[in-house]
Interface confidence: medium
């Protein structure tokens, strides 16, 4: 204000942010600030975060005469104290038939046989624990495995000698190996019977299976 003009401390009001001006002397004033503000003209926001109650990793965000908690994804509520039920929010959180189990600050999956990982998306490598005989090839399946045998070997684990190698089945019969005991099984053509299909049979009988 110039020397020739009349200075009135509260006209216009120097108080900001809704503060009210009170003249305290000929040239002095005082601002009464609204909650959440301070300063000689109420210009400064009071930081409400120093005594915040945000929990579980929540970050305090100052407001005007208040604060909010920015919660990590696993928590919710005013102070991040309420657990988020991920099983409700994400119905497909667990894959391949796994069962979702909500926990404080997270969730877990109970996987069905053959699957593992946080969301049951990883097929367990059953070959890692398989006992296929050396020289055979292990094929991983869901909750199981199979052994692909080299020539001359048979059985679930390729641990048996293949009885069909010696061509025990006669007369063009089909030879199969019993995977449990390694013995040969001859499927005889029409008109033959016996363990190795060497016997003639009466007419009217069809194919015969013989185990040995």
């Amino acid at each position: 204000a110039g020397s020739d003009s009349l200075y009135v401390p509260c006209a216009p009001s120097p108080c900001v942010n809704g503060g009210t001006c009170r003249q305290t002397g000929d040239f002095t004033f005082e601002c009464n600030c609204l909650p959440g503000f301070e300063g000689s003209t109420c210009e400064r926001n009071i930081d409400d975060c120093p005594n915040h109650r945000c929990q579980n990793g929540g970050v305090c965000v100052d407001g005007v005469n208040t604060y909010n908690c920015r919660c990590p994804p696993q928590w919710t509520g005013q102070f991040c104290t309420e657990d988020v039920d991920e099983c409700l929010l994400q119905p497909n959180a667990c894959q391949n038939g796994g069962t979702c189990a909500n926990r404080n600050g997270g969730y877990g999956c109970v996987c069905v046989n053959g699957w593992s990982g946080d969301d049951c998306s990883e097929n367990i490598d059953d070959c890692a624990f398989a006992s296929c005989t050396p020289g055979s090839t292990c094929i991983d399946r869901v909750a199981s495995f199979s052994c692909m045998c080299p020539e001359g070997k048979a059985g679930l684990l390729c641990h048996l000698d293949d009885a069909c190698i010696s061509n025990p089945c006669h007369k063009g019969a089909l030879c199969d190996t019993n995977p449990l005991n390694g013995q040969y099984i001859c499927t005889c053509p029409q008109g033959y019977k016996g363990a190795d299909c060497t016997e003639d049979v009466d007419e009217g009988n069809s194919h015969h299976h013989h185990h040995h």
Partner: antibody, heavy 120, light 107 residues
Framework: EVQLVESGGGLVQPGGSLKLSCAVS????????MEWIRQASGKGLEWIAA??????????VYSASVKDRFTISRDTSKSTLYLQMNSLKTEDTAVYYC???????????WGQGTLVTVSS | DIQMTQSPSSVSASVGDRVTITCQTS??????LAWYQQKPGKSPKLLIY???RLQDGVPSRFSGSGSGTDYTLTISSLQPEDFATYFC?????????FGGGTKVEIK
């Protein structure tokens, strides 16, 4: 005319104490927030302490770097602002300024500064 | 605490040039920003307060603008006495924080 004049700086050993003064004139001292700011040689400005005005009960706020070591106060009868500095560290070496917070987000008057050197 | 990012850290300019300095804050400070000029061995001098209001006695070639988190100090036509270091400062909440400074040098 608004004036602020600091004094009390000097050389002090680590762990020692020093009290800075800032004599003010030209305005109603009790109506204003007062601040202490420091500046290490060739560096930026760092706010360290404030004392609010009479309307706000002369309450105090400190920066984390000096809390529990420095104390700001004022004597209105002497129109002087003080900064008592205890447990001084080498990193407290700086020029210390007192300033008047004019409201409206600006520090509108500054002293000339006083140099504090903490060294053994 | 509110972080202040001031750029550039230095600028070389000639008399008559237009110089722009920016200051970015880590959160909205609702125009609660001041700009200061400091010359070697001297104390800072308030130029702009409230982001855009010119302090009494400061030449009109200095101007401030901005809102939210982005603020600018502009010197429209650089004068010899303007070669100095400039600082921004937020006064929106304690602790008060300053930008790192911009040194305006002669090209």
């Amino acid at each position: 005319e608004v004036q602020l004049v600091e004094s009390g700086g000097g050389l002090v050993q680590p762990g020692g104490s020093l009290k800075l003064s800032c004599a003010v004139s030209g305005f109603t001292f009790s109506d204003f927030y007062m601040e202490w700011i420091r500046q290490a040689s060739g560096k930026g400005l760092e706010w360290i302490a404030a004392q609010r005005n009479k309307a706000n009960d002369f309450s105090i706020v400190y920066s984390a770097s000096v809390k529990d070591r420095f104390t700001i106060s004022r004597d209105t009868s002497k129109s002087t602002l003080y900064l008592q500095m205890n447990s001084l560290k080498t990193e407290d070496t700086a020029v210390y300024y007192c300033s008047r917070d004019g409201g409206k987000w600006g520090l509108d008057a500054w002293g000339q500064g006083t140099l504090v050197t903490v060294s053994s | 605490d509110i972080q202040m990012t001031q750029s550039p850290s230095s600028v070389s300019a000639s008399v008559g040039d237009r110089v722009t300095i920016t200051c970015q804050t880590s959160e909205d400070i609702y125009s609660g920003l001041a700009w200061y000029q400091q010359k070697p061995g001297k104390s800072p001098k308030l130029l702009i307060y409230g982001a855009s209001r010119l302090q009494d006695g400061v030449p009109s070639r200095f101007s401030g603008s901005g809102s939210g988190t982005d603020y600018t100090l502009t010197i429209s036509s650089l004068q010899p006495e303007d070669f100095a270091t400039y600082f921004c400062q937020q006064g929106f909440k304690y602790p008060l924080t300053f930008g790192g400074g911009t040194k305006v040098e002669i090209k």
